[in-house]
């Protein structure tokens, strides 16, 4: 239904009352200069708010930091600035929260000129108590957490330095000079890239990538003339420069970098770039930017293995190297991603997959907008979703697109109706089946989150004037209430709610200004009274991913299975609560040649699933053939979709090809791997 | 053209069970949910529960908690009803019927076939 | 669980007449909402589903109308083969039924 039609709308009653009970004011007694908050735990109601203040003297910046603690959702804060000894924080490095609920904190000082090394503060309490500690370097990036054990942690020092700890920041060790770039792999391995000669800009294409398994105590090279290097899911990645030319390609790993594959993609110039997507255990996106400065490239979807590679969609938007695009992967919904493309006259259009990259079409118009001025035909025209590059533009798009996992199916988003992203005013739109239908949620730019798991969303106009009202929904943004949550408007500067949607507060950020001062000011609103009861199986009713038509056979098949959900009734007003956990089915479908890809050599002409031999190699298939390893050149032309888990049907099984024959020259062996110790 | 086909008349005594089945025909039985509806001698009609092919996935009226199971065997694209503790009140026209569907969702659209019925009659 | 109250629970009619059967929900269903009808000795058939929408086949002169808690079926002109038995039926909750409508040869 349209927004605001009243007919439809359950109103919950007495909400004033309601909220007025829990709405928490929070005035924070400094200078207005720059706030950063974050969430310390998960359920733990910790928040750790950071103010700083810059005056830029002549000679120096003198600054002023100061720290609030709160443990309860953000509803009171205490200043905890003494426990930093009334330090200057560098909000560059913000507060390096610990992985999960291991309640550690690092906070990286501003330390005088002619310190020896830097400053860090540490907690391993849920911020409750600090220890000073004076680093022997300077760090150059944030403290980076072992995902495996938090108490290992790495950093680079301003001198290239690779740095690391044990003991949670307790004592660094030098593990390596001359490093570019550093993260943790799995199992507390850490990759690095080095450099021999001059610096890492300098050496860019002739690093060489480390990998230690003992934190610094043995080393192994893995790789050399290296351009730069990801992680992804379960696959290491290194783009590697040519022997012949300034050229580089994209080498693979699935076992830490012991063995590496040359994955079959496109060689890209100097001025291009690969960009890893998104990946999961299963697969990876790679974007790969065209010659020349278009600002356009094509996505590849790999096979399990990272090595072979399906064209998924041509004319990618993703601005020159490390730019923007809006490549969003739709997490309430699996197989779900969302992109732009830039059409032949240079409009951009929105562009969705399902079925995690087979397949893109426009998004349906929804029901209740009208084609704008973009549109050639006032009846037939798409949805377009504002994301990064819109905002990178400065559009007067406050949010990107919104999913959240336990909100299965909802993704809220800005956008335009028409054939391509408009520069006019965007409206927010909603849908609630993982991206297949939109209804116009809110008019206008807004920002806005899910609280409890789905059960609540909450939204704020954009305004550039002060705010004083918050809008909320109780059936997925169908029907909106407003609620003043203060007399005096604040100019509005951010919304936040604790991060996995669980949560049933939201914390309205602003400032005040009057004549003379200016102040931060926070009101924390709790939603607990307005969702009364706990939600009961009655609340819930059964819904089909994927459905497009219950008369097909395989209604809701995406990667070989479907999955029905419980969900929340629209009309329930009740609490899916803090320990709510998404309820599925799965069901197993039949295999069809939907759920195979070509291997190599292979391809699917136009409209047609039959993966098909290629009639001779040549480009980057001819390359790969040539330096690609071998038992990959063996195969009967078609593997599984990674993640597919499809069974009987069509088993496309014929004879076993060796490609070897296609290629032209005789295989390289592929560079013999050192090790070392320290 | 798709049919729900119903076991036949059942007479019981009070105390025991029925088990009451209803065969699909002519499509596609996994992707819709089967509810069952119940119908004493001049009365109203009574929904009793539902089941989802995907995983067996019932749920039942307050009512019939306990008292009722709803099962589902894709493979013969047949649903079956089983009431227990059978009592006099229990004796009425059974119906299974497709729950109709145009999205996901599987109870929202109204139940657009029905199967002949199932007389039970429950008697000492 | 949701109640639904059909009225009248009787309705004499002639040939041609418009007529018109209310539903009331105890709470909102937004437009959850099903139309049947029964005649003695057969199964029940349905005639509008999602309050407003005409099942395939159903003759044009049924219509449904409403939303939230108010909902009415409408026979425009009342043929013969339409003396029967008529149902709401909610689907927003568990599914609860209307206690019936007859419309009987005045």
């Known amino acids: 239904s349209a927004p605001g039609e009243d007919e439809e709308c359950g109103r919950v009653r007495d909400f004033v009352a309601k909220l007025a009970n829990n709405t928490h004011q929070h005035v924070f007694d400094d200078l207005r200069g720059s706030v950063s908050l974050s969430w310390v735990g998960d359920s733990t109601g910790v928040i750790l708010v950071l103010t700083t203040f810059h005056v830029p003297l002549v000679i120096m910046t003198f600054g002023q930091s100061k720290l609030y603690r709160s443990e309860d959702y953000g509803k009171n804060f205490k200043d905890i600035t003494d426990l930093i000894n009334n330090t200057f924080i560098r909000t560059e490095f913000g507060m390096a929260i610990g992985p999960e609920n291991s309640g550690k904190v690092v906070l990286t000082a501003e330390v005088s000129g002619g310190s020896r090394g830097g400053r860090i503060f540490r907690s391993s309490d849920f911020a409750k108590n600090f220890v000073q500690t004076d680093l022997p370097f300077h760090p150059l990036t944030q403290m980076m957490y072992s995902p495996q054990n938090s108490d290992y942690l790495l950093a680079l020092s301003t001198e290239n330095g690779l740095w690391v700890s044990k003991n949670f920041g307790g004592k660094w060790e030098e593990i390596h000079k001359a490093v570019c770039l550093a993260k943790w792999g799995s199992d507390n391995t850490i990759f690095f890239t080095t450099y021999a000669n001059g610096s890492c800009k300098a050496d860019l294409g002739a690093l060489e990538l480390w990998r230690t398994s003992d934190l610094g105590k043995s080393f192994k090279t893995i790789g050399v003339k290296i351009y730069s290097f990801g992680l992804g899911g379960r696959f290491l990645f290194a783009s590697v420069m040519a022997d012949k030319d300034t050229t580089r390609r994209i080498h693979v790993s699935t076992d830490q970098g012991d063995t590496w594959s040359m994955a079959q993609l496109p060689s890209v110039g100097q001025e291009q770039f690969y960009s890893i997507l998104a990946a999961n255990d299963d697969m990876v996106f790679m974007h790969v930017d065209e010659p020349g400065d278009t600002g356009f490239g094509t996505i590849f979807t790999s096979d399990d293995r990272g090595i072979v590679y399906s064209k998924s969609l041509d004319r990618h938007l993703y601005t020159t190297t490390g730019g923007e695009t809006d490549f969003t992967n739709v997490t309430s919904l699996r197989g779900v991603y969302i992109t732009s493309v830039l059409s032949e006259d240079n409009s951009i259009q929105t562009m969705i997959t399902f079925d995690q990259g087979g397949r893109w079409t426009h998004l349906r118009k929804p029901e209740n907008s009208e084609c704008d001025a973009t549109a050639k035909n006032k009846n037939e025209c798409s949805l377009h979703i504002h994301a990064s590059y819109s905002i990178s533009q400065k559009l007067n798009v406050p949010m990107a697109p919104l999913s959240e996992p336990n909100a299965v199916g909802i993704v809220i988003a800005h956008g335009s109706v028409g054939d391509a992203i408009s520069v006019m005013v965007p409206d927010v739109y909603i849908s609630d089946d993982g991206g297949y239908s939109w209804t116009k949620m809110l008019e206008g730019p807004h920002y806005y989150t899910i609280l409890d798991s789905g059960g609540i969303i909450v939204a704020i106009e954009h305004s550039s004037r002060p705010i004083n009202v918050i809008k909320f929904s109780t059936d997925e943004g169908q029907c909106w209430q407003t609620y003043t949550f203060t007399r005096d408007p604040i100019y509005f500067t951010g919304l936040a709610s604790e991060p996995g949607a669980r949560s049933m507060n939201i914390s309205i950020w602003g400032f005040t200004e009057s004549f003379l001062t200016s102040q931060w000011v926070s009101y924390t609103i709790d939603f607990k009274d307005i969702l009364e009861r706990n939600c009961e199986e009655k609340d819930y009713t059964i819904w089909l991913a994927h459905s497009t038509d219950p008369e097909d056979y395989e209604d809701g098949c995406i990667l070989g299975y479907k999955e029905a959900f419980l969900r929340l009734r629209k009309s329930s007003v009740c609490q899916n609560g803090r320990d709510y956990v998404v309820t599925k089915q799965p069901s197993i479908c039949l295999c069809s040649l939907e759920d195979f890809l070509c291997d190599f050599g292979y391809y699917r002409p136009e409209n047609d699933s039959k993966c098909v031999e290629q009639p001779e190699l040549k480009g980057h298939d001819l390359e790969f053939c040539l330096y690609g390893r071998e038992e990959h050149l063996t195969t009967n032309g078609y593997r599984k979709i990674p993640g597919d888990k499809c069974q009987g049907g069509v088993n496309p099984v014929r004879e076993v090809k060796d490609l070897k024959k296609k290629c032209t020259s005789n295989f390289l062996s592929p560079e013999k791997q050192n090790s070392k110790s320290n | 053209q798709v049919q729900l086909v119903q076991s036949g008349a059942e007479v019981k005594k009070p105390g025991s069970s029925v088990k009451v089945s209803c065969k699909a025909s002519?499509?596609?039985?996994?992707?819709?949910?089967i509810s069952w509806v119940r119908q004493a001698p001049g009365q109203g009609l009574e929904w009793m529960g539902g089941?989802?092919?995907?995983?067996?996935?019932?749920n039942y009226a307050q009512k019939f908690q306990g008292r009722v199971t709803i099962t589902a065997d894709e493979s013969t694209s047949t649903a079956y009803m089983e009431l227990s503790s059978l009592r006099s009140e229990d004796t009425a026209v059974y119906y299974c019927?497709?729950?109709?569907?145009?999205?996901?969702?599987?109870?929202?659209?109204?139940?657009?076939?029905w199967g002949q019925g199932t007389t039970v009659t429950v008697s000492s | 669980d949701i109640q639904m109250t059909q009225s009248p629970s009787t309705l004499s009619a002639s040939v041609g007449d418009r007529v018109t059967i209310t539903c009331r929900a105890s709470?909102?269903?937004?437009?959850?909402l099903a139309w049947y009808q029964q005649k003695p000795g057969k199964a029940p058939k349905l005639l509008i589903y999602?309050?407003?929408s005409l099942e395939s086949g159903v003759p044009s002169r049924f219509s449904g109308s409403g939303s939230g808690t108010e909902f009415t079926l409408t026979i425009s002109s009342l043929q013969p083969d339409d003396f029967a038995t008529y149902y709401c039926?909610?689907?927003?909750?568990?599914?609860?039924f209307g206690g019936g409508t007859k419309v009987e040869i005045k």
């Open positions: 039926q909610q689907a927003d909750g568990h599914i609860t």
């Open positions: 089941i989802i092919p995907i995983g067996g996935w019932a």
């Open positions: 002519g499509g596609t039985f996994r992707n819709y949910a």
């Open positions: 019927a497709r729950q109709g569907r145009k999205t996901g969702y599987y109870y929202y659209y109204g139940m657009d076939v």
């Open positions: 709470q909102s269903i937004s437009s959850w």
């Open positions: 999602k309050a407003s």
